[in-house]
């Protein structure tokens, strides 16, 4: 029997220092560009090689960004979210939600599961 797929959701505060080429990532989402059904949140779609985010190592593709410098990203148009990042200054604090896929074993198995993704 196949196990079901569950998700372990954690939150983290990530402080980035803007590098010579910026923060070094792309985003999708917003009220006018829903990336996840019924969720207008902002998601990291690309971490650029050798950019500030990649060098820091904590931000991951697929993470949901909840706030920038304490400002909530809920219910923002996509371009407004983009502008918020671009105007966020030199030191940028991100509150992010990581979603780790966990493959559970068959029913009755009480192991921790096999993280993947």
């Amino acid at each position: 029997m196949n196990g079901r797929v569950d998700y372990l959701v954690t939150e983290e505060e990530i402080n980035l220092t803007r590098g010579p080429s910026g923060l070094g990532f792309n985003i999708v989402g917003g009220t006018d560009q829903q990336y996840v059904s019924n969720d207008s949140g902002i998601y990291v779609s690309r971490i650029k090689e050798n950019g500030a985010a990649a060098l820091d190592g904590r931000l991951q593709e697929g993470d949901k960004i909840l706030s920038v410098n304490g400002q909530d990203l809920k219910n923002l148009l996509h371009q407004d979210a983009v502008d918020l990042f671009r105007n966020a200054g030199y030191a940028v604090s991100l509150r992010v939600q990581h979603r780790l896929q966990v493959q559970n074993g068959p029913i009755g198995h009480r192991g921790e599961g096999d993280p993947s993704g």
């Epitope: 080429s21 990532f25 792309n26 999708v28 779609s45 593709e61 996509h78 371009q79 983009v82 671009r86």
Partner: nanobody, 128 residues
Framework: DVQLVESGGGLVQAGGSLRLSCAAS????????MGWFRQRPGKERDVVAT????????YYLDSVKGRFTISRDNAKNTVFLQMNSLKPEDTAVYYC??????????????????????WGQGTQVTVS
Amino acid sequence: DVQLVESGGGLVQAGGSLRLSCAASGRPFSSLDMGWFRQRPGKERDVVATINWTGDSTYYLDSVKGRFTISRDNAKNTVFLQMNSLKPEDTAVYYCAARGGGSSVDSEYDVGGFEYDYWGQGTQVTVS
């Protein structure tokens, strides 16, 4: 990480057609910009065609315009390259490539160019 597997290559006569497919796995396909590149014998790897994550923007190498068509099927996690009116100079190893799409948080002018983060192993196309 993203895994890419190309298929559909082969030997075809000049004037013929082939349809290349690239199946992606490892993360949501709908957020990926996709591209097809080729490496001809003794040459650098060149971009052939690209399609952005929303499917509303495409690019074609001048020499394939009107002959090749890139498309994507998000339901099947697959990108296609329909190649018609093939010429001997189209002979090459064709590679599928992917990167995260969306908007750069750094600059409106940073559209990524032809820099891709994930690559397939390639499929040989030979036009005789």
